[in-house]
Each structure stands twice: as C-alpha cells, then as structure tokens.
C-alpha cells in the first residue's frame, strides 16, 4: 500500500502514524496548496488541526480580512491558521470544534461543538455551531445562529459601531457578542474591567481577559 | 479607571418605594449607556433597565414595566432608577454597569432601545442590597 504524503488534517496525519504534536504540512482541498499547522496529538485522543491559539501577547491579533483570510503568526506559538482553508476544510466533512481556555488563577475550561464549520469569503466566512458541551458555560459564547467575521477593514457585525476596531481583532463579532478571543491580550493583573480583552463570557464575564486559548478541530468520525 | 457607584439601596415594605443612584467616572458620560442588573440569591443575573443619556433610549424589563423608571442627570454624570411598587421578588442585589452607546444594532436605534444582554456590559459597579419584605 502507497504511503499518504499529503493530508487534509491532523486527523489524517495521526491516523498515519504520525502521533507526536507539532508543526505539520497539511494540503488544502482538491488543490497542492500547502499551509503549515499545529498538530495536537495529546489532547482527547490526538488528531486536533490547531486554527487559533494565544498565550502569551507576542503576536498582533488586530490584523486584515486578507491576513486572517490566509492566516498569520507561528504554528509554534501564537496563530490564526487561515479562514480559508478552515473554510474549505469543513465544508467537506464533518468537522467538530473544541475551544480550550486558561485563566490566570490556573483554572482550565473548554467547550465542545459536535458540528463546526465556517462558510465561504462570499459568505464573510460565517460560522456555524451547534451541540455545545463543556465546562465554559452552558450557553455558547459564540452569538447564536452564528454571525459573520469582521476584521479592522472589513465589518460586518451587526452594530452600528464598528466591533473589530471598538474590541480589537477579527471575530464573528454580532453586536458585538459575548466574546472575542482574538482581542488584546493582557497580562496579569491588567486583565480585569477590559472592553477590549480575549473575552469568553459565559465562564469569566464581563472585562476578564484570559491567559490563553486553543481552537482546535476534527473530523467527527475521528 | 472607570467607576461606577451604586448608592440608595435598603429594606423597605412591599408596596414602598425606592431610589436608587449610580455615580459615574472615568468615562465620556454621553457616550456610554448605563443599565441596571439584579440578581437574586441563587438566581441568574438579569437586566432590569438602561438608559443611553445621548438619545434617551431606555429599555425595561417586563418584570418592571410601569413600576421602574430610569433617568439620567447628565451633570452629576448620575443614573438613577426610581423603583415603586416593590414586590418581594424585587428582593436582590441591584448593579449598575456601562457599556458605548454605539454598541446597538440599527435595528434597536431605530425602536430606541439599549442593551439588556449583561454580557454587552464592560464595566460594573459593585452593588447594592434591595430587600423588600411583605
């Protein structure tokens, strides 16, 4: 049997036997172009294609349509993998979504999306969700029925204001929505009553601004 | 640093009235929009009322709707909520809070409305204990 050279995901990666985390090359759908990505092989059982994580405020989240469109940062520490491709990716399978979230009092928390996937640039790159689980709240801090992404230059929230330049960041932003984990990151003991923070309401609330985020996905049959 | 001070709480009979102030600082008064949130022992926090001061947009919940009423004093950068009516599920500890007025939907511009989702709220005060007995 031939050996799989390119993959879709970390999920294929894994399955290959390929089962240590890291930097991995992965091909966009139906086409050679490559995007390079972190693989979490660790967490719940491995396979997990990394397409945001913060930690630690080294890299600037208030960016572009175009660089959140084609990703930006290191795989390695803080990045946004790309709308694009996260948008091509899901819209072949099944896709779920878990976000993982760290405060500054060294508590951890999660929540879990059985359905995940974003549509396409003509479509703002929406986000779809639903089947929530977890331990960062029972009511999804992503604006439901999802919203459209918007960025600096290109806003498509749902407010009168302009929620990515108010809050800081690209996010599916409604008006403007109970959170935002590309927002300014803060560090510790600057990072209560702030407008503009990497926000997650239904498990810290208003104006706390977390120490770190992972959004991480896989195929639902994994 | 923003700061909102809540004062005027206190017991009273059901049926009595109170009034309640929020004292405002460290932001652009007219360009904010100041609600008031409740929340009772081993209840969720909900909104009460809010006022946006540049427009006078108000919003009440149904729960309070013909006994509260909110109002703004642009020069004492104040917010008071005139409670009468009380019932004793009035009971609870009343926040004020304060979110950019422009942080609305055309759609609630246009119904002159502000916000009563909490999670929209940035800033909040400490609070102030409302006990109505019957």
């Known amino acids: 049997k031939e050996e799989q050279t390119t993959f879709r995901d970390c999920a294929e990666i894994f399955k290959s036997g390929l089962t240590t985390s890291g930097i991995y090359t992965l091909t966009f759908p139906n086409s050679t172009e490559e995007i390079k990505a972190y693989c979490d092989m660790d967490v719940g059982g491995g396979g997990w294609t990394v397409i945001q994580h913060r930690e630690d405020g080294s890299v600037d989240f208030q960016r572009t349509w175009k660089e959140y469109k084609e990703g930006f940062g290191s795989p390695l520490g803080e990045y946004w993998l790309g709308n694009e491709f996260v948008s091509q990716l899901t819209g072949q399978h099944r896709y779920v979504l878990k976000i993982q979230l760290k405060d500054w009092e060294g508590n951890e928390a999660h929540s879990l999306y059985d359905h995940f996937y974003l549509a396409g640039e003509e479509s703002n790159y929406r986000i779809h969700l639903t089947g929530l689980t977890g331990t960062a709240g029972k009511i999804s801090s992503i604006s439901q029925p999802g919203s459209d992404f918007s960025t600096k230059d290109s806003d498509n929230d749902k407010c009168i204001c302009k929620c990515s330049q108010m809050l800081s960041g690209g996010w599916w932003f409604d008006a403007c929505g109970p959170s935002n984990l590309n927002g300014q990151y803060y560090p510790q003991k600057q990072n209560t009553n702030k407008f503009n923070g990497i926000k997650w309401y239904y498990w810290k609330g208003s104006g706390y601004s977390l120490k770190a985020t992972t959004m991480m996905i896989r195929p639902a049959d994994f | 640093e923003v700061q909102l001070v809540e004062s005027g709480g206190g017991s009273v009979q059901a049926g009595g009235s109170l009034r309640l102030s929020c004292a405002a600082s460290g932001f652009t008064f007219d360009d904010y929009a100041i609600g008031w949130f409740r929340q009772a022992p081993g209840k969720e926090r909900e909104g009460v009322s809010c006022?946006?001061?540049?427009?006078?947009?108000?919003n009440y919940a149904d729960s309070v709707k013909g006994r509260f009423t909110i109002s703004s004093d642009t020069a004492k950068n104040t917010v008071y909520l005139q409670m009468n009516s009380l019932k004793p599920e009035d009971t609870a500890v009343y926040y004020c809070t304060a979110v950019p007025a422009t942080r609305r939907t055309p759609q609630m511009v246009d119904a002159n409305m502000c916000w009563l989702a909490e999670y929209e709220y940035d800033y909040w005060g400490q609070g102030t204990q409302v006990t109505v007995s019957s």
């Open positions: 006022i946006s001061s540049s427009d006078g947009s108000t």
